[in-house]
């Protein structure tokens, strides 16, 4: 028996369902009574889902997993993982034993898009050229950790005086706060880009200072 899985990681959005694909080639005359199928976490060997003794033994993992019972006899041993969480991320091993055994691991990468950044200034009034201001770019509920880039109105990267912090909430999603300290020119635009490295998703925020008033 030869087990095959996708070599590329499966990318799943938080709160959506994901399918971890696994297949084997049944011999002629194969019946499900011969099958021992186990999905487990690769590192800890924690049981996730199993099929043995001719029947689906169910989920051993948060009751959020399912096989495709009608397709098993054709060699489809894929696992459905429902309502994906950040903590589901990692490697899963598909182990198939019939006459012989084989196994392969598939990687699950969890992702969540970042919100459109909100921009705040401090101080936010009586601004004059030459003043030092703090611009904060905040984006929420993303995963994994973001990459943050700042640019001026001409598209020139601003790398000095930038402090970025990322805090995970109780669901494991990150809130990003990036602070840029700049000396104001006569006018200018400051842009913040929050990038999700897995989804290749960019969220943009900007603030334009043209004397008074400010535009966001």
């Amino acid at each position: 028996v030869e087990v095959q899985v996708s070599e590329d990681p499966v990318v799943a959005l938080v709160d959506t369902d994901a399918t971890l694909r696994c297949s084997f080639s049944p011999e002629p005359g194969f019946s499900l009574a011969q099958l021992n199928l186990i999905w487990q976490l690769t590192d800890t060997k924690q049981l996730v889902h199993s099929f043995t003794e001719g029947r689906d033994q169910g989920s051993a993992y948060s009751n959020r997993t399912a096989l495709f019972p009608d397709l098993l006899v054709q060699g489809n041993a894929s696992l459905r993982l429902q309502r994906v969480r950040v903590t589901d991320e990692g490697s899963y091993t598909c182990f198939v034993s019939i006459q012989d055994f084989d196994s392969a691991a598939v990687s699950l990468q969890v992702a969540a898009p970042y919100s459109k950044p909100s921009m705040t200034l401090e101080p936010n009034k009586d601004l004059r050229p030459g003043n030092m201001v703090t611009i904060t770019c905040s984006s929420y509920q993303g995963y994994p950790e973001a990459e943050v880039f700042w640019k001026d109105g001409q598209g020139v990267p601003l790398t000095g005086n930038v402090t970025t912090s990322q805090m995970a909430n109780e669901r494991g999603l990150f809130d990003v706060h990036s602070v840029l300290r700049v000396v104001l020119g006569a006018n200018g635009t400051y842009s913040c880009l929050v990038r999700n490295p897995v989804l290749q998703q960019d969220a943009h925020g900007s603030v334009t200072i043209t004397g008074q008033p400010l535009t966001f």
Epitope: L35, N36, I38, K45, T52, T93, F95, Q99, D102
Partner: antibody, heavy 119, light 108 residues
Framework: EVQLVESGGDLVQPGGSLKLSCAAS????????MSWVRQTPDKRLELVAT????????YYPDSVKGRFTISRDNAKHTLYLQMSSLKSEDTAMYYC????????????WGQGTLVTVSA | DIQMIQSPASLSVSVGETVTITCRAS??????LAWYQQKQGKSPQLLVY???NLADGVPSRFSGSGSGTQYSLKINSLQSEDFGSYYC??????????FGGGTKLEIK
């Protein structure tokens, strides 16, 4: 008749290496997974390596991982166990076994070959 | 890895008696369990597979039972040739499939 004949056991110093062989006959060797099981002087049994029929998948317990390597030559109907960085606790009788259809246990065992690790 | 706790470690009984050896798994192994007998100086021999099935040539006085995490091997009316050591082994999940510590059955 299924036959499994082990060879290669010897007295070896700690840190040394040894390669065990198992010659199989009486069945279609390339259709079966195979395992090495050892029995320590205190009579405990431990499965130290297992390999599937085409040699593509192997498993080891933590006690030997990185030190032992199981392999097979289906053309020669032979199973191997390469052991390196040997320790005194590897002293045991090493048995070659055939993996049966799942849940059917290890129905065929060789006579064993003795490995002694001692200074 | 799954742990197999076998008891008792040793047993001294007379011919004709009935004995029961038990094996407890650290998690559900879904009847993926084998029992072996080993005589002094010999290789282990398969007695029971899939918890309850007798291997070829095994006398009917041997029987296996159990499910989930608890399994047992029963020998009715012990014969002199039954003395030796007995081991359980699970076959659940990915290898290595671990053995119990063994039970030495001696003549009283």
């Amino acid at each position: 008749e299924v036959q499994l004949v082990e060879s290669g056991g010897d007295l070896v110093q700690p840190g040394g290496s040894l390669k065990l062989s198992c010659a199989a006959s009486g069945f279609t060797f390339s259709s079966y997974g195979m395992s090495w099981v050892r029995q320590t002087p205190d009579k405990r049994l431990e499965l130290v390596a297992t390999i599937n029929s085409n040699g593509g998948t192997t498993y080891y317990p933590d006690s030997v991982k990185g030190r032992f390597t199981i392999s097979r030559d289906n053309a020669k109907h032979t199973l191997y166990l390469q052991m390196s960085s040997l320790k005194s606790e590897d002293t045991a009788m090493y048995y070659c076994t055939r993996n049966e259809e799942f849940r059917r246990g290890l129905a065929y065992w060789g006579q064993g070959t003795l490995v002694t690790v001692s200074a | 890895d799954i742990q197999m706790i076998q008891s008792p470690a040793s047993l001294s009984v007379s011919v004709g008696e009935t004995v029961t050896i038990t094996c407890r798994a650290s998690e559900n192994i879904y009847s993926n369990l084998a029992w072996y007998q080993q005589k002094q100086g010999k290789s282990p021999q398969l007695l029971v597979y899939a918890a309850t099935n007798l291997a070829d040539g095994v006398p009917s006085r041997f029987s296996g039972s159990g499910s989930g995490t608890q399994y047992s091997l029963k020998i009715n009316s012990l014969q002199s040739e039954d003395f030796g050591s007995y081991y359980c082994q699970h076959f659940w999940g990915t290898p290595p499939w671990t053995f119990g510590g063994g039970t030495k059955l001696e003549i009283k």
